[in-house]
Interface confidence: low
């Protein structure tokens, strides 16, 4: 530890400003009052401090708020947020969406760090559920956020929040997650007309049961092969050749290219050859 504590005459910082970038670490420690720093945190982001200098500023805040920073300070942390550890963040009580946005902005363009994951976890737990505004914000910054949650965590997502979900937000979800999300989506979109409903529900269909797929096949939805390939195998197997033909519409010809891949492969093996031949695709059961 570098111990240079006595502030040289005339160096006491009256405010947080550009002149502090010329202070060495020990001078920041000695000459910047922690309470002043806390009240002028919004200025820190505009000053090009080095990582080492930011370490000192963090240290001062830690000493001022050993039980965790108040939200007024957290909201203005800016790049200092990158210096926080998950342990630091677990002490926080973040309730404002504006605070969350401000901190996510700092990490924008990077993968979700353990710090961000902890921050989001604290925020969502504080709110009690993943409401639409929060989900909107989180998926805007991290399209893969929803798929990073466990099925248990996803169970707390209210159906109304599903409106904030975009197709790309579900790209990395596995079947267990879609099993949880699909019923919520079905409920959220239940009052839409057929064609609009399919557009919205399409990305969630990896969690759909057989009976829902059968119902969709009666609605001329023309499901594309990419969506079909993401369906649960156990949900696809009971479908008849006629139902799959109706479900896929003009896209049925794509089955030939996918005949060696699940769930198409497994579905073909369950069908009578005579029925497959009606498709005229040369599929062999």
């Amino acid at each position: 530890e570098v111990e240079k504590t006595a502030c040289p005459s005339g160096k006491k910082a009256p405010e947080i400003d550009e002149s502090l970038i010329f202070y060495k670490k020990w001078e920041l420690e000695a000459c910047v009052d922690a309470a002043l720093l806390a009240t002028q945190m919004d200025r820190v982001n505009a000053i090009p401090f080095t990582y080492e200098q930011l370490d000192v500023l963090k240290h001062k805040l830690d000493e001022l708020y050993p039980q965790g920073y108040p939200e007024s300070v957290i909201q203005h942390l800016g790049y200092l947020f990158l210096k926080m550890s998950p342990e630091d963040i677990r002490k926080w009580n973040v309730t404002s969406l504006e605070t969350l946005k401000a901190l996510l902005e700092v990490n924008k363009g990077h993968e979700m760090s353990p710090q961000v994951a902890t921050l989001i976890d604290r925020f969502v737990k504080g709110r009690g559920q993943l409401d639409k505004d929060t989900l909107d914000t989180l998926t805007a910054f991290y399209p893969g956020y929803l798929c990073s949650l466990s099925p248990e965590e996803l169970s707390s997502v209210p159906p109304s929040s599903i409106w904030a979900v975009r197709p790309q937000d579900l790209d990395t979800c596995d079947p267990r997650q879609l099993d949880v999300l699909y019923p919520k989506a079905r409920l959220a979109f239940q009052n839409m007309n057929g064609s609009e409903y399919f557009v919205k529900i399409q990305s969630f269909l990896g969690g759909a049961p057989t009976e829902d797929l059968k119902a969709l096949s009666q609605q001329n939805v023309s499901m594309d092969l990419a969506t079909f390939m993401k369906l649960r195998t156990d949900a696809v197997l009971p479908l008849t050749v006629a139902e799959v033909q109706k479900l896929l519409g003009p896209h049925v010809e794509g089955l030939k290219a996918e005949e060696r891949h699940r769930p198409v492969r497994d579905w073909i093996l369950r069908q009578r050859q005579d029925d497959l031949d009606t498709l005229g695709l040369g599929l062999q059961g």
Epitope: E1, A6, K24
Partner: antibody, heavy 112, light 112 residues
Framework: EVQLQQSGADLVKPGASVKLSCTVF????????MHWVRQRPEQGLEWIGR????????IYGPKFQDKATITADTSSNTAYLHLSSLTSEDTAVYYC?????WGHGTTLTVSS | DIVMTQAASSEPVTPGESVSISCRSD???????????LYWFLQRPGQSPHLLIY???NLASGVPDRFSGSGSGTAFTLRISRVEAEDVGVYYC?????????FGAGTKLELK
């Protein structure tokens, strides 16, 4: 590991000047703050002053304002203590230090 | 200047027992960051001083946890539990709150 290597013992005559050196190893010298402390025979410790090698800014204890000059050479990672108008009162061990690291001390004897 | 006072010039102790060494300052050493800038050094016979405790209660690296520092504002205590032969020497307190840095006169720990 940080090491502070001080110059050897010196015997000088009253009225003369002397320059003691302290070379730092294992540390970024510009990030240091080199202090000098003296200890007269059978006495306690007295702070002489310190230098910031990055900008040569130095501060002295009131008692040493006219006695001591601390300088630093960043190219050799060495701090110097220049003592002038020496009297027998200046006979002491002079230590350079950086926070928790002390040199072994240089014994200065002022005698005719 | 801040005056540091170590009332006891010597402290006799039996090996294995505990001992407390006290130090006072004539001004509070509490910095606005919540730390008390009080240091403890040990100078063993014939050696340079070395740091034991910094910021009143923090153990310097390599120092056994038999040593502990406490206090507040102007009154400070260095406690050594289970004193060993190697603990013999002069203990100095020093304030690092403002310049000039000042030391106490020292307390000599002697074995009975």
């Amino acid at each position: 590991e940080v090491q502070l290597q001080q110059s050897g013992a010196d015997l000088v005559k009253p009225g003369a000047s002397v320059k003691l050196s302290c070379t730092v190893f294992g540390l970024n010298f510009k990030d240091t703050f080199m202090h000098w402390v003296r200890q007269r025979p059978e006495q306690g410790l007295e702070w002489i002053g310190r230098i910031d090698p990055a900008n040569d800014n130095s501060i002295y204890g009131p008692k040493f304002q006219d006695k001591a000059t601390i300088t630093a050479d960043t190219s050799s990672n060495t701090a110097y203590l220049h003592l002038s108008s020496l009297t027998s009162e200046d006979t002491a061990v002079y230590y350079c230090l950086y926070f928790d690291n002390w040199g072994h001390g240089t014994t200065l004897t002022v005698s005719s | 200047d801040i005056v540091m006072t170590q009332a006891a010039s010597s402290e006799p102790v039996t090996p294995g027992e505990s001992v407390s060494i006290s130090c006072r300052s004539d001004k509070s050493l509490l910095h606005s960051n919540g730390h008390n800038y009080l240091y403890w050094f040990l100078q063993r016979p014939g050696q340079s001083p070395h740091l034991l405790i910094y910021r009143m209660s923090n153990l310097a690296s390599g120092v056994p946890d038999r040593f502990s520092g406490s206090g507040s504002g102007t009154a400070f205590t260095l406690r050594i539990s289970r004193v060993e032969a190697e603990d013999v020497g002069v203990y100095y307190c020093m304030q690092h709150l403002e310049y000039p840095l000042t030391f106490g006169a020292g307390t000599k720990l002697e074995l009975k």
